[in-house]
Interface confidence: low
Amino acid sequence: MNGSEYFVKIQSFLGGAPTEDLKALSQQNVSMDLATFMKLRTDAVLPLTVAEVQKLLGPHVEGLKAEERHRPVRDWILRQRQDDLDTLGLGLQGGIPNGYLVLDLSMQEALSGTPCLLGP
């Protein structure tokens, strides 16, 4: 069974998938469509790297621009380094500026909804 066929079989269960499952899927050439991606749990999507999302979505990564103001894409963008977002070539804006450090202060992030940044 190839990646696309496997994805079709598990598609209906993906809404509640944890980050670990999404990371594993990104290695299996599944080409997740954007409608499915948009239904994923925000907390599961946030830890994914730009490279992992690119592999997870395949050709559909080019549709992220259309969803950049909607969750979970909006929140995921806020967690990525702008340099990394730029590699997608989609004009996605709102990433962490170059030279900033991201502090994993989970409590503050839970309260504010955004990561804590330290300037350069």
């Epitope: 190839n2 079709v8 080409s31 395949g58 050709p59 590699t87 989609l90």
Partner: antibody, heavy 120, light 107 residues
């Protein structure tokens, strides 16, 4: 409005190379990958590959990996495709088309195409 | 690679008729299919995306349907300007692939 300007014809000799251009206007050039499609006379469409206008990254159809080289010039909002070691099999119309533009998947806009004729 | 098969190379119809152009994918592509119309000497024109959504400006007599592996482009009340070749395309996975095309002829 979106416009994609391509030269009408190119006449080249077997074994030579040719560089085709696609001048884009009417949208933010760096926001959408530019793709290239081949159509031989009286035949169907073949996807050659796409290029990321932000950083020049490419994604090729394996069939064309050694035949085509895709590049971009952000300053002139132009995408180029160089075809090398030309044979009669390369005689075709070549189209450029941005993907996922206007938040819609697929190729909503196409250039007029460049007819390449390989003839000794 | 995913192969998109349009088994009918030619279809003949009369003005005002309803015609269905079919396309079959070699594996499940969900609804990640687009349809294009190409008139002689012109660039392809996008008609349908995501299997069933019309691009803006496309007449509502063009309707797309299907999911998984089987897709249909239906043209109702065929007009003389619909004389063209129609291609399906999948964008579910790389490489992006097109069907071989179906030429619509008006009787």
């Amino acid at each position: 409005q979106v416009q994609l300007q391509q030269p009408g014809t190119e006449l080249v000799k077997p074994g030579a190379s040719v560089k085709l251009s696609c001048k884009a206007s009417g949208y933010t050039f760096t926001t959408f990958w530019m793709h290239w499609v081949k159509q031989r006379p009286g035949q169907g469409l073949e996807w050659i590959g796409g290029v990321n206008p932000t950083n020049g990254g490419t994604n090729y159809n394996e069939k064309f990996r050694t035949k085509a080289t895709l590049t971009v010039d952000k300053s002139s909002t132009t995408a180029d495709m160089q075809l090398s070691s030309l044979t009669s099999e390369d005689s075709a119309v070549y189209y450029c088309a941005p993907h996922y533009i206007s938040s819609r998947p697929g190729f909503a806009y196409w250039g007029q195409g460049t007819l390449v004729t390989v003839s000794g | 690679d995913i192969v998109m098969t349009q088994s009918q190379k030619f279809m003949s119809t009369s003005g005002g008729d309803r015609v269905s152009v079919t396309c079959k994918a070699s594996q499940n592509v969900g609804t990640n299919v687009a349809w294009y119309q190409q008139k002689p000497g012109q660039s392809p024109k996008a008609l349908i995306y995501s299997a069933s959504y019309r691009y803006s400006g496309v007449p509502d007599r063009f309707t797309g349907s299907g999911s998984g592996t089987d897709f249909i482009l239906t043209i109702s009340n065929v007009q003389s300007e619909d004389l063209a070749e129609y291609f399906c395309q999948q964008y579910n996975s790389y490489p992006l692939t097109f069907g071989g095309g179906t030429k619509l002829e008006i009787k």
